[in-house]
Amino acid sequence: SGPVKELVGSVGGAVTFPLKSKVKQVDSIVWTFNTTPLVTIQPEGGTIIVTQNRNRERVDFPDGGYSLKLSKLKKNDSGIYYVGIYSSSLQQPSTQEYVLHVYEHLSKPKVTMGLQSNKNGTCVTNLTCCMEHGEEDVIYTWKALGQAANESHNGSILPISWRWGESDMTFICVARNPVSRNFSSPILARKLCEGAADDPDSSMV
């Protein structure tokens, strides 16, 4: 029995739970998901029983091996998977535990602008990046592209200080999770500061 294996999958995608055994006479292999039986295999008997019929089309065994491939992943497939290999040649079953995290492919992040001040020819505000559907485990970074130097900023909130007359800057939010990344629409400092003069608490996509 090895350490817990962490696996990552994306909604609609597939994941393979790796499993190898050097046991000659495997009587049965039992896979469970959050304590619910998922699949029972009897290699010598040639039978594979998928407990819930709706999972039959999602279960496969690549190259006829012991590893289990689960496809058409859904968010609620996230959880703990456990496999036991039972054999008369083993005093106790050989076991392995897996933790699966299923993530959605990220949609375009939304950017909102906080209160803005225009003092001494300098436009000061915050841009906040967020996912509309509250996706989990999202990491945000900002890219600030200008003529001088390109800068990166970690976190969902980007403080901006832009002086009128300086070369224009472009801000892009990058949202990442373990399976995908997506970009906000680019935001130009000049446009942002012009628009904000009229509407001090505005939002943009």
Epitope: K24, T47, D63, G64
Partner: antibody, heavy 120, light 108 residues
């Protein structure tokens, strides 16, 4: 990649023996059952027996009444099938075939075949 | 010994048509049936094992079904390369494993 390469064609006399070899590569030879299957000209497939290369355990089709012996050489990753007391009806293509792990009676990789012709 | 019977012996169809091949076992073999494709001069190729599990790399136009004594291999839309002989095999419990006599799928 996974490959099973068999020895060349044989022409044998009635009453003699033939030994066919099957060299495995691209996978762990000792961890999968190796089967032998034959096919007479224009006929169906016939399972002869199998060996577990890890420990040499064998299982045979009773039809061959002790005429077939399957062995292996672990150091050479090679399996052998010997058929004795040959008769004309043993003229056939002989295949070695690896068992899948998940269903040990299903065979996923096959050798190219060895034609054995028995003549009087 | 478990005896497998395949029908029809020959199936004459055109490319694009659906092929349905039958295999009957003389006794209950649960879901332990495999299907193979064989072309002239070549070794058999595993298509399906445990009645309905497609082997890696096999196109999804091939599907298997059945349990107990009645099994079916379906080719949803025949491609030119699918014209061949198809064998069912029972791989239930202890050997000997047995094969059916085969169904030849040829071009109409």
């Amino acid at each position: 990649q996974m490959q099973l390469v068999q020895s060349g064609a044989e022409v044998k006399k009635t009453g003699s023996s033939v030994k066919v070899s099957c060299k495995a590569s691209g996978y762990t030879f000792t961890s999968s059952w190796m089967n032998w299957v034959r096919q007479a000209p224009g006929q169906a497939l016939e399972w002869m027996g199998r060996i577990y290369p890890g420990d040499g355990d064998t299982k045979y089709n009773g039809k061959f009444k002790g005429r077939v012996t399957i062995t292996r050489d672990r150091s050479m990753s090679t399996a052998y099938m010997e058929l004795s007391s040959l008769r004309s009806e043993d003229t056939a293509m002989y295949y070695c075939a690896r068992s899948t792990m998940i269903a040990t009676g299903a065979m996923d990789y096959w050798g190219q075949g060895t034609l054995v012709t028995v003549s009087s | 010994e478990i005896v497998l019977t395949q029908s029809p012996a020959t199936l004459s169809l055109s490319p694009g048509e659906r092929a349905t091949l039958s295999c009957k076992a003389s006794q209950d073999v649960s879901t332990a049936v495999a299907w193979y494709q064989q072309k002239p001069g070549l070794a058999p190729r595993l298509l399906i094992y445990s009645a309905s599990y497609r082997y890696t790399g096999i196109p999804d136009r091939f599907s298997g079904s059945g349990s107990g004594t009645d099994f079916t291999l379906t080719i949803s839309r025949l491609e030119p390369e699918d014209f061949a002989v198809y064998y069912c095999q029972q791989h239930y419990s202890t050997p000997p494993y047995t094969f059916g006599p085969g169904t030849k799928v040829d071009i109409k």
